[in-house]
């Protein structure tokens, strides 16, 4: 019994004065607590407690279930204890079969012994199966067997407490360990689509998938900058013991423009949190926006190729696309395709391939596209650059020499005089009259220029050159003059092409 200094309150004393007492089943348990300030006896086993206000605890016929810790407490709150084993060969274990463990923590298999003198107190697997190799335990006859550092792999492990009694192995009732996994990473969250574009009145539905080791992961849909509780529907699955998946589906049955915004799927566990967002844009009606990828005014050289390219945004998706020129629809030479294969793609590309363009093929090329809500169009003005062509070169009755040339861009006509037989005409002659004529051809076709000079200025034999040129090239026509007496005659005109 403990000894204390005089004057200080002392713990009660218990008879018999030993820490452990072994009695046989059916025998009497008689425990006496001596203390002037006696309050109560308390009996504890397997988390169950009983009290007795008598200072003598008497159990006439002891049973195995009377095994446990008997504590006497006085008015000062001081106490003393004795542990009683009631030896019963037919009931070697007291058991509480409820067995839970947390991963990486210790857990107690509650199977205290009724006889401390049995040997080899340990754990065994059910049905003769071995225990996991890494399972470590510490036996305590008064409490049970402590499994150290529970592993996830021990979940639903079936086991018995075991002792050797008179050379034979005796097993307790079965226990099945239920393990709660430790969260060692944040939940994995993903969303069905990163962005949604809807028309007013359409249904918005988005699904967040949450994956974790346990169903106790918390998840919710939140609207950014809003506290409103959103309506969610759930579907969940256990793919084995520690592979849990939940789908949280958020639905707005009839979306409005003011529902537009960012929605966040948030999940957390004891390790940390994770989130993923999706953007909703609700428009009052559909739209088409066209973006030319080249300038809408196009200059191309005669015989060359050009691609007219547009990108366009269309929502809802485009239903009809066409390219038109001179009120005629192209049936081929063009292609239309989505900018990306992404499910939420609203951007498309259309390309018209014009090959070996002729001077007569300039004009307005129009791309038209429509969906169920709107139509849209864009026009390209295509100009075909052509080298000048001299259409006419004549000596008029009034003595004028006239040269008419066509080309694009608008040709310039210069006049030169070559005296005698010289090949090079260097002396320039100023025209009397220059006019740009209206072409009878299509718009964007060649421009026609007429230029005249007065032939009376020429007093000697020679050649007059009419040279028409632009950025693309040049062409010349020639007038030959010969004087017979006082008469001037025009000899046949001819043209030369100078590249």
């Amino acid at each position: 019994q403990p000894s204390v200094s005089p004057g200080e309150p002392s713990p009660p004393s218990i008879h018999p004065g030993k820490s452990d007492l072994i009695v046989r089943v059916g025998d009497e348990i008689r425990l006496l607590c001596t203390d002037p300030g006696f309050v109560k006896w308390t009996f504890e086993i397997l988390d169950e407690t009983n009290e007795n206000k008598q200072n003598e605890w008497i159990t006439e016929k002891a049973e195995a279930t009377n095994t446990g810790k008997y504590t006497c407490t006085n008015k000062h709150g001081l106490s003393n204890s004795i542990y009683v084993f009631v030896r019963d060969p037919a009931k070697l274990f007291l058991v509480d079969r409820s067995l839970y463990g947390k991963e990486d923590n210790d857990t107690l298999v509650r199977c205290p012994l009724t006889d401390p003198e049995v040997t080899n107190y340990s754990l065994k697997g059910c049905q003769g199966k071995p225990l996991p190799k890494d399972l470590r335990f510490i036996p305590d006859p008064k409490a049970g067997i402590m499994i150290k550092s529970v592993k996830r792999a021990y979940h639903r492990l079936c086991l018995h407490c075991s002792v050797d009694q008179e050379g034979k192995s005796v097993l307790s009732e079965k226990f099945i360990l239920k393990v709660r996994p430790a969260f060692k990473a944040v939940p994995v969250v993903s969303v069905s689509k990163a962005s949604y574009l809807l028309r007013e009145g359409e249904e918005f539905t988005v699904t967040c998938t949450i994956k974790d080791v346990s169903s106790s992961v918390y998840s919710t849909w939140k609207r950014e900058n809003s506290q409103t509780k959103l309506q969610e529907k759930y579907n969940s699955w256990h793919h084995g013991d520690f592979n849990y998946e939940r789908q949280a589906t958020l639905t707005i049955s009839s979306a409005r423009v003011n529902d537009s915004g960012v929605f966040m799927c948030y999940a957390n566990n004891t390790f940390g949190s994770a989130n993923v967002t999706t953007t909703l844009e609700v428009v009052d009606k559909g739209f088409i926006n066209i973006f030319p990828m080249i300038n809408t005014t196009v200059f191309v050289n005669d015989g060359e190729n050009v691609d007219l390219i547009v990108e366009y945004e269309a929502f809802p998706k485009p239903e009809h696309q066409q390219w038109i020129y001179m009120n005629r629809t192209f049936t081929d030479k063009w292609e239309d395709y989505p900018k990306s294969e992404n499910e939420s793609n609203i951007r498309y590309v259309s390309e018209l391939h014009l090959t070996r363009l002729k001077g007569t093929e300039g004009g307005t090329y129009t791309f038209l596209v429509s969906n169920s809500d709107v139509n849209a169009a864009i026009a390209f003005n295509v100009y075909v650059n052509t080298k000048p062509e001299i259409l006419t070169y004549d000596r008029l009755v009034n003595g004028m020499l006239q040269c008419v040339a066509a080309g694009f861009p608008e040709p310039t006509i210069d006049w030169y005089f070559c005296p005698g037989t010289e090949q090079r005409c260097s002396a320039s002659v100023l025209p009397v009259d220059v006019q740009t004529l209206n072409s009878s051809g299509p718009p964007f076709g060649k421009l026609v220029v007429q230029s005249s000079i007065d032939s009376s200025a020429f007093k000697h034999n020679g050649t007059v050159e009419c040279k028409a040129y632009n950025d693309v090239g040049k062409t010349s026509a020639y007038f030959n003059f010969a004087f017979k007496g006082n008469n001037k005659e025009q000899i046949h005109p001819h043209t030369l092409f100078t590249p």
Partner: antibody
């Protein structure tokens, strides 16, 4: 004696809340996982929610997740089910049940009736 | 979720005769620990359910030995060797391998 007694049921309008209680006696409540199971009129049994012995682990059937909350007070030997945003389809007799060592329900309360009606 | 399907849904039996109820699961209920997480319950008229069989074949405390459970994986059977009048009620199978689900119930009645 060993028993579970539910209370807190009643008639409630859709969208409103109700809290059910389950008082345990005759056993060490804090050592057991506890469940709620319901039974709609004339229908079969449907599991609703579970809570571990210490309150750390909880799970719910998908149809009540986010609306119902299971909790326990081991010092009062009482299990609770907080039911928010109630719907007509939540109308049922609600039973609390104790989970034994083999994860079976070895003890059931007598049930409490919840009627959700406008 | 694992779907539990019971048959028959109604079972009229003469007292003293045997009875058998089948329960099939949409996936195996056999855990790596060797146990089938399949339980049987009886709900007598006007009463709460009571546990009859746990882990596929183990009789619960106080359950008469005329009740027996068998089967493994996805196919399970509850047998009553000789039906008595007090056995009337609805029998449910329940899986506890994953999120708990019940069968739709089999009503046993006396002919």
């Amino acid at each position: 004696q060993v028993q579970l007694v539910e209370s807190g049921g009643g008639v409630v309008q859709p969208g409103r809340s109700l809290r059910l209680s389950c008082a345990a006696s005759g056993f060490t409540f804090s050592r057991y996982g506890m469940h709620w199971v319901r039974q709609a009129p004339g229908k079969g049994l449907e599991w609703v929610a579970v809570i571990w012995y210490d309150g750390t682990n909880k799970d719910y059937t998908d149809s009540v997740r986010g609306r119902f909350t299971i909790s326990r007070d081991n010092s009062k030997n009482t299990l609770y089910l907080q039911m928010n945003s109630l719907r007509a389809e939540d109308t049922a007799v609600y039973y609390c049940a104790r989970e034994d060592w083999a994860e079976a329900f070895d003890m059931w309360g007598q049930g409490t009736t919840v009627t959700v009606s406008s | 979720d694992i779907v539990m399907t019971q048959s028959p849904l109604s079972l009229p039996v003469t007292p003293g005769e045997p009875a058998s109820i089948s329960c099939r699961s949409s996936q195996s209920l056999l855990h790596s620990n060797g146990y089938n997480y399949l339980d049987w319950y009886l709900q007598k008229p006007g009463q709460s359910p009571q546990l009859l069989i746990y882990l596929g074949s183990n009789r619960a405390s106080g359950v008469p030995d005329r009740f027996s459970g068998s089967g493994s994986g996805t196919d399970f059977t509850l047998k009553i060797s000789r039906v008595e009048a007090e056995d009337v009620g609805v029998y449910y199978c329940m899986q506890a391998l994953q999120t708990i689900t019940f069968g739709q119930g089999t009503r046993l009645e006396i002919k």
